[in-house]
């Protein structure tokens, strides 16, 4: 009789997590009669999978009845495949005995598992920064097999070329992470602006996995500062206006100073939106002429969003307006818009409008 | 190591029926086929019928179709054998065995149950 | 049914002489290339011990003075160098279909 042969006809076998995977294994005689074993990997450190002979293997199905006359079908069926099941699979042919002897192995089967990446998830930088600075924002997506994977980075649909990205473990393993950083500029008109990265992968069947992140996360975009006097009121009293326009987030205060003393001190809330995603607010106060002997020095105080204060200052010129009267006022706007802030590179921006 | 451990011996009445059992040890139960046979005194081996404990499928001699039932308890690896109208012939020692090879032959066997028939 | 007949009944062999029982089928027990005879021992008080399966493989842990041959219908079990404890009664079964099994042959030491 011809010499038993154990068969493992495929070399290598891919399966997508959460399916089945059928090893096949022949053997070419009835002779010797003994058992099959299926084991994980070789030596002593082997793990086994399947025994028709003896042990409890829940996830592990005989193709072929074992007790079908002649049997010499011995391929498995292993249900509900993780990641972790990934590895050389052998068919191993038993002489019976007492114990039984191990006789003749097959070639093996490599079982790699297709895991699809988790969705991808974008997180931005911890602090706000404002236009012409750059901030990182960063994509991380897991679980993946085989290790082969595709990452892009889009701003408002456009692809970004500044990023690096990292794919790990370096060497095999059962499942794979990536993670990527993209460099991004912001501009003042960024608010509405969205990050995404696109993951694509062999088990997405050409349907990218996403994630976004929105700059209005990362960006602060200064108000701008402009104080104006109305015309006088019949009643002596001149009413200023402070424009606080173009800002983001909401998050401010502003502060009216008398001569340097606070007159009123209000927070923005619920402010319309500008098409841009920017705010605009504006606060009048009232000063009573006929009340100062000297001019009045108004300061307009913002504090937006955390940030140290911008001022923009404006004279209210007593002498212009004589008490008894209620017109041709006359006011001297001396303040500067100072729109100070300190950013990540430490440098000091001074704008005067 | 497999193991088949037979009842006891029983004495009956003719007539009436017998019931072996034979729990199986030491490999999978419903991966192998248990056979009966039995030996009546000075006689040779009688082939009685076969059982897969995996779906309860049976083949019986013949001679043993009206009168043997094959059973198992796949929760205990238990396998039974019960003759009815017993007559004094069939005062034997009857085996069980299971196929290791699925060859329909008998690779391991218990130590045998004596049914005695008499009035 | 397959019925076979075993020959001799008894036999009567020196120690260290060959042995040979022969078992015949009513017909042929061979499919797919395998002859489907089995050889059993069976020792006084004991349940039967196999032998040899499809007519020529050792059984594991069965001494290689034991053999077996044949196909189609004739087999022979040759025991070549007889030991006392191999005394004791053998017995042929075929399973080309439903098991069935030889009358038996006893052997004794002459």
């Known amino acids: 009789e011809e010499e038993l042969q154990v068969i493992q006809p495929e070399k290598s076998v891919s399966v997508a997590a959460g399916e089945s995977a059928t090893l096949n294994c022949t053997a070419t005689s009835l002779i010797p009669v003994g058992p099959i074993q299926w084991f994980r990997g070789v030596g002593p450190g082997r793990e086994l999978i399947y025994s028709q002979k003896e042990g409890h293997f829940p996830r592990v199905t005989p193709v072929s009845d074992p007790t079908k006359r002649n049997n010499m079908d011995f391929s498995i069926r292993i249900s509900n495949i993780t990641p972790a099941d990934a590895g050389t699979y052998y068919c191993v042919k038993f002489r019976k005995g007492s114990p039984d002897v191990e006789l003749k192995s097959g070639a093996g089967t490599e079982l790699s598992v297709r895991a699809k990446p988790s969705a991808p998830v974008v997180s931005g930088p911890a602090v706000r920064a404002t236009a012409e600075h750059t901030v990182s924002f960063t994509c991380e997506s897991h679980g993946f097999s085989p290790r082969d994977i595709t990452l892009k980075w889009f701003k408002n649909g456009n692809e970004l070329s500044d990023f690096q990205t990292n794919v790990d473990p370096a060497g095999k393993s059962v499942s794979y992470s990536i993670r990527s950083t993209a460099r991004v500029v912001l501009t003042r008109r960024d608010v509405h602006s969205q990050v995404i990265c696109e993951v694509a992968h062999v088990t997405l069947q050409g349907d990218p996995l996403r994630g976004t992140a929105n700059l209005s996360e990362a960006i602060r975009v200064p108000p701008f500062l402009e104080v104006t006097q109305q015309s006088m009121r019949a009643d002596n009293q001149v009413n200023v206006t402070c424009q606080v326009t173009k800002f983001y987030p909401q998050r401010l205060q502003l502060t009216w100073l008398e001569n340097g003393n606070v007159s009123r001190t209000e927070m923005a809330s619920a402010l319309p939106e500008n098409k841009d995603g920017t705010y605009n607010w504006t606060s009048w106060l009232l000063v009573n002429v006929s009340a100062h002997r000297d001019d009045v020095k108004l300061t307009c105080q913002v504090e937006h969003d955390g940030q140290p204060a911008v001022n923009k200052s404006f004279s209210v010129k007593v002498s212009a307006h004589p008490k008894e009267q209620g017109s041709n006022t006359a006011a001297e706007n001396t303040g500067t818009n100072e729109r100070d802030y300190k950013d990540d590179d430490d440098k000091h921006h001074h704008h005067h409008h | 190591q497999v193991q088949l451990v037979q009842s006891g011996a029983e004495v009956k009445k003719p007539g009436a029926s017998v019931k072996v059992s034979c729990k199986a040890s030491?490999?999978?139960?419903?991966?192998?086929?248990i056979n009966w046979v039995r030996q009546a005194p000075g006689q040779g081996l009688e082939w009685i019928a076969m059982?897969?404990?995996?779906?309860?499928?049976?083949h019986y001699n013949q001679i043993f179709k009206d009168r043997a039932t094959l059973t198992t308890d796949t929760s205990t690896s238990t396998a039974y054998m019960e003759l009815r109208s017993l007559r004094s012939d069939d005062t034997a020692v009857y085996y069980c065995?299971?196929?290791?090879?699925?060859?329909?032959?008998?690779?391991?066997w218990g130590r045998g149950t004596l049914v005695t028939v008499s009035s | 049914d397959i019925v076979l007949t075993q020959s001799p009944d008894s036999l009567a062999v020196s120690l260290g002489e060959r042995a040979t029982i022969n078992c015949r089928a009513s017909?042929?027990?061979?499919?797919?290339?395998?002859?489907?005879i089995f050889w059993y021992q069976q020792k006084p008080g004991q349940p039967p011990k196999l032998l040899i399966y499809?007519?020529?493989n050792l059984d594991s842990g069965v001494p290689d003075r034991f053999s077996g041959s044949g196909s189609g219908t004739d087999f022979t079990l040759t025991i070549s160098s007889l030991q006392a404890e191999d005394v004791a009664v053998y017995y042929c079964q075929h399973s080309r279909d439903l098991p069935t099994f030889g009358q038996g042959t006893k052997l004794e030491i002459k």
């Open positions: 030491g490999y999978t139960f419903t991966n192998y086929w």
């Open positions: 059982i897969d404990p995996s779906d309860s499928e049976t």
């Open positions: 017909k042929s027990v061979s499919s797919s290339g395998y002859n489907y």
């Open positions: 065995a299971m196929d290791y090879g699925s060859l329909y032959a008998m690779d391991y």
């Open positions: 499809l007519a020529s």
